[in-house]
């Protein structure tokens, strides 16, 4: 996988009225890094990992860099010609990569209202835009609003995919490995359901990057998706995530059923315990 | 003697259909995974659908799918494989095949039948 | 669909020789991993199961390795009833099988 840098921003209006706050999260590696909070911007690392990778001295770089992105795009959202009322909201995501060859990929993308109405490759400088009406009037919008703004357009906008790269090689270079491995504990439990049946819970914790499979396997046949339920994968505060997979099966054929792990090129099975080990909450209620 | 047995294999003209059985005898059929598996003339195996043994999980390869209906009746001891809007490219030797339960397996075929010729003719 | 490539598609071996069959899957699979034996008219046969296991009733002289997406059945000495056809089957997303290795007489 290639390294990345992710910058996610948000600014909100309420009937017209642009929020004086944004909200700002980074995401290094895939990893959430950095999060600028709405009302002050105050770049606070997630974890001791990313503390190591900024250092304290550099926070204030941040800070600054995200405050004017911030105002940038406030800017835009008052620009934008749309309906006034209620609550709106405007994102800009900005992606760049650095793989292994050496090559790198750098994107933005607009959202408003949560739809994507507007994206520019920023190595190419070229725009797409999804086919729908609306999307297409809000591109119009915006893109005239930076063009209008030569001196942003120039300095802010064109420098991204520069200032994107140059920032993902400065973390890259600061002596800490991002792509370290943290292999997952696997339990797997049980617990009563009815009629003969009872629901197993494989649950992976603990583990880094993020990308797992976890999945029930039949005989060493995989379940078909509608057959299994699956938890998000959610960070578990220490830097590393969790997730479960559950199904359920006939009491008695216990053997025949395994947890698969796959992560980071390890994988394992697990088996369902034979002794009763009751779990209270079942996620198929 | 643990065996499988198609059968309802035959010459049939192309977009026809045709239902193979497949008896199990010796074991609990309801107990384990089964699939068919085919072997055009002179070629190699193709799996070409999976059902598990509660019927919850079925698969199919993508040159039958919407085609070939998977399904069995446990008390009869039988595996089916409905097959319509047949092809040329269809013409055959059918095998069912068991998926072996013995623990650490990995989607093993155990048990095979000894097949049966379906020939699609145009 | 995950792809499953023998090699070679035939070879050509005496009696008493070590034959040895590859099998690359296009991602890897683990070691979900299954070899078979085919007689002319005949059904399939397995031999190995989960990249190394030997099913229950086969000669010792059957090996299989390998994990991921790089696979090996070894015949350490062949046998004349081992002149016959040999797949690998992968089921680690869904199943399906490779193109067969002939084993003839050489």
């Known amino acids: 996988e290639p390294h990345s840098l992710r910058y996610n921003l948000t600014v909100l209006s309420w009937d017209g009225s642009v929020q004086s706050g944004f909200l700002t999260e980074v995401h290094l590696d895939g990893q959430p890094f950095l999060r600028c909070d709405r009302q002050k911007c105050r770049a606070k690392p997630q974890g001791q990992w990313a503390e190591d990778v900024l250092g304290n001295k550099t926070w204030d770089r941040e800070t600054r860099d995200l405050t004017g992105n911030g105002k940038d795009l406030r800017m835009t959202l008052a620009h934008i010609k749309d309906q006034k009322e209620g609550l709106h909201s405007l994102q800009e995501i900005r992606v760049c990569e650095i793989h292994e060859d050496n090559s790198t990929r750098s994107s933005q993308h607009f959202y408003y209202d949560g739809e994507l109405f507007l994206s520019q490759n920023l190595e190419t400088k070229e725009w797409t835009m999804p086919q729908s009406s609306r999307a297409q009037t809000l591109a119009m919008n915006v893109r005239n609003f930076l063009k209008e703004d030569a001196m942003k357009t120039k300095t802010h906008y064109h420098a991204m995919h520069a200032d994107c790269l140059q920032e993902l090689r400065r973390y890259l270079k600061s002596g800490v490995v991002l792509r370290r491995t943290v292999p997952p504990m696997v339990n797997v439990t049980r617990s009563e359901a009815s009629e003969g049946n009872i629901t197993v819970t494989c649950r992976a914790s603990g583990f880094y990057p993020w990308n797992i499979t976890l999945s029930w396997r039949q005989d060493g046949v995989s379940l078909s998706h509608d057959t299994q339920q699956w938890g998000d994968v959610l960070p578990d505060g220490n830097g590393t995530y969790q997730t479960w997979v559950a199904t359920r099966i006939c009491q008695g054929e216990e053997q025949r059923f395994t947890c698969y792990m796959e992560h980071s090129g390890n994988h394992s099975t697990h088996p369902v315990p034979s002794g009763k080990v009751l779990v209270l909450q079942s996620h198929w209620q | 003697e643990v065996q499988l047995v198609e059968s309802g294999g035959g010459l049939v003209q192309s977009g026809g259909s045709l239902r193979l059985s497949c008896v199990a005898s010796?074991?609990?059929?309801?107990?384990?995974?089964m699939n068919w598996v085919r072997q055009a003339p002179g070629k190699g195996l193709e799996w070409i659908s999976y059902?598990?043994?509660?019927?919850?999980?079925?698969y199919y390869a993508d040159s039958v799918k919407g085609r070939f209906t998977i399904s069995r009746d446990n008390a009869k001891k039988s595996l089916y494989l409905q097959m319509n809007s047949l092809r040329d490219e269809d013409t055959a030797v059918y095998y069912c095949a068991r998926v072996s339960d013995i623990t650490g397996n990995t989607g093993s075929f155990d048990i095979w039948g000894q097949g049966t010729t379906v020939t699609v003719s145009s | 669909d995950i792809q499953m490539t023998q090699s070679p598609s035939s070879l050509s071996a005496s009696v008493g020789d070590r034959v040895t069959i590859t099998c690359r899957a296009s991602?890897?699979?683990?070691?979900?991993l299954n070899w078979y034996q085919q007689k002319p008219g005949k059904a399939p046969k397995l031999l190995i199961y989960a990249a190394s296991s030997l099913q229950s009733g086969v000669p010792s002289r059957f090996s299989g390795s390998g994990s991921g997406t790089d696979f090996t059945l070894t015949i350490s000495s062949l046998q004349p009833e081992d002149f016959a056809t040999y797949y690998c089957q992968q089921s680690y997303s869904t199943l399906t099988f490779g193109g067969g290795t002939k084993v003839d007489i050489k």
């Open positions: 991602q890897s699979i683990s070691s979900y």
């Open positions: 059902i598990s043994s509660r019927s919850s999980t079925i």
């Open positions: 010796g074991f609990t059929l309801s107990r384990y995974s």
